[in-house]
């Protein structure tokens, strides 16, 4: 997260880290005791999933292996359309005050809605600085019409933009797959942005979760 702040401890109990060995690979969101939602571009053969801690590499955090993941069938590596994936945990999480599932959206929030995005991604760009603490940024949803003025054809129909005018605050490498939460519901998954990160007036781009609720529910049901 560029130009963010340290999240209030325990305020994101649904936030998970997808680790490759013990290195951060991507963020993710707990949606069920067996399931983590993340970005399709975060796909690996297997994952070490850290839950229940705001510190990356926390020895006291729950760590669960995951060997199965289900990318949206329409995902494109080139255009990033349908950049959404479900990761099935090999064993169920132990729910607690530190580990909770996020609330999936009942509706799509409108432009102007205040939201918070979180992650352990680099806080500087192009030179990288990875924080140990979970970082947050407060952003507002931006209409597709406004966002298309910046990204033109790069912006797909199920992509959601968020940012703050004239501000550098944004997501960056390592934040991918993490949650954009608005009014206590999951509205976005970190998908992409301009590199180097933090270009003022270049919004962060997210997968618009409200458009995928049916796919999420059906995929979890199919692979129970």
């Amino acid at each position: 997260i560029i130009d963010g702040y340290k999240c209030k401890e325990g305020s994101h109990p649904w936030q998970v880290a997808l680790l490759k060995g013990n290195q951060l690979h991507c963020g993710g969101v707990l949606v069920d005791k067996y399931w983590v939602l993340t970005a399709a571009h975060c796909k690996m053969g297997q994952y070490q999933v850290q839950l229940g801690s705001d510190k990356i590499g926390d020895q006291s955090a729950q760590k669960i292996k995951a060997t199965k993941s289900f990318r949206h069938p329409g995902y494109s590596t080139k255009t990033h359309v349908n950049d959404i994936m479900l990761v099935r945990l090999d064993e169920p999480v132990k729910m607690s005050s530190k580990v909770e599932a996020v609330q999936l959206p009942e509706h799509c929030e409108p432009p102007g809605t205040s939201c918070t995005v979180s992650g352990w991604g680099t806080t500087t760009s192009p030179d990288v600085t990875f924080p140990s603490d979970l970082m947050c940024s407060d952003v507002k949803l931006i209409s597709s019409r406004e966002c298309k003025k910046v990204y033109k054809d790069l912006l797909g129909k199920t992509m959601l933009c968020a940012g703050i005018p004239d501000s550098k605050t944004n997501t960056c490498n390592g934040d991918s797959g993490g949650p954009l939460v608005c009014n206590d519901t999951l509205q976005g998954l970190v998908s992409w942005g301009t590199y180097p990160c933090g270009q003022p007036n270049d919004p962060g781009v997210y997968t618009q979760v409200c458009k995928y609720k049916r796919w999420v529910m059906e995929t979890m049901k199919t692979h129970r």
């Epitope: 990033h80 192009p126 790069l154 942005g193 301009t194 007036n201």
Partner: antibody, heavy 122, light 107 residues
Framework: QVQLQESGPGLVKPSQTLSLTCTVS??????????WSWIRQHPGKGLEWIGS???????YYNPSLKSRVTISVDTSKNQFSLKLSSVTAADTAVYYC??????????????WGQGTLVTVSS | DIQMTQSPSSLSASVGDRVTITCQAS??????LNWYQQKPGKAPKLLIY???NLETGVPSRFSGSGSGTDFTFTISSLQPEDIATYYC?????????FGGGTKVEIK
């Protein structure tokens, strides 16, 4: 289809400034997510990234050339330019302009100009 | 700067042969690795991006693999039109850097 075309003098005297312009057609230079780059290739040698500019004017340069390089953009003309000062014979190369798709997820040079040979000689 | 070491610097193979080029980065670059083809007197052309993704319109005989520091570029069945120099390029960090190139010739 995006097309890039380099223009400028093919011969520059030592100690002078090399100036090249790249004209972009078939796409807007003001598109977010794309940087506009200069890359050079010494005769019979490999490729060297010189630097890139964003539509906003934000620039990134190769540290090995930074003290001598200026890249600018003119969005109204859909052009960007390279200036390389205090040139020597070692700056003789084919200069390419290119578009770089630069996202957090992937970054690559997808469109290139045909290149222009610049010779530094008195 | 990240150094990219490409090998071999040149190779000669017969039409129909499988050709393999390797590229090694001086530090971990995840999958931010691209491959380009350059024919004499022409600009480079993108073939593979993100280590393994084939650019639109590029024949499927070209492929790429690898992650971290070690990468491979393969032409499954060499064709006469594949005579060119091939370059790898890292896009993990600025400054972007290229390998020294591999010149591919037909025996």
């Amino acid at each position: 289809q995006v097309q890039l075309q380099e223009s400028g003098p093919g011969l520059v005297k030592p100690s002078q400034t090399l100036s090249l312009t790249c004209t972009v057609s078939g796409g807007s230079i003001s598109s977010g997510g794309y940087y506009w780059s200069w890359i050079r290739q010494h005769p019979g040698k490999g490729l060297e990234w010189i630097g890139s500019i964003y539509y906003s004017g934000s620039t990134y340069y190769n540290p090995s050339l930074k003290s001598r390089v200026t890249i600018s953009v003119d969005t109204s003309k859909n052009q960007f330019s390279l200036k390389l000062s205090s040139v020597t014979a070692a700056d003789t190369a084919v200069y390419y302009c290119a578009r770089a798709k630069q996202l957090t997820t992937h970054r690559y040079f997808d469109y290139w100009g045909q290149g222009t040979l610049v010779t530094v000689s008195s | 700067d990240i150094q990219m070491t490409q090998s071999p610097s040149s190779l000669s193979a017969s039409v129909g042969d499988r050709v393999t080029i390797t590229c090694q980065a001086s530090q971990d670059i995840a999958n931010y690795l691209n491959w380009y083809q350059q024919k004499p007197g022409k600009a480079p052309k993108l073939l593979i991006y993100d280590a393994s993704n084939l650019e639109t319109g590029v024949p499927s005989r070209f492929s790429g693999s690898g992650s971290g520091t070690d990468f491979t570029f393969t032409i499954s069945s060499l064709q006469p039109e594949d005579i060119a120099t091939y370059y790898c390029q890292q896009a993990s960090d600025l400054p972007f850097t290229f390998g020294g190139g591999t010149k591919v010739e037909i025996k």
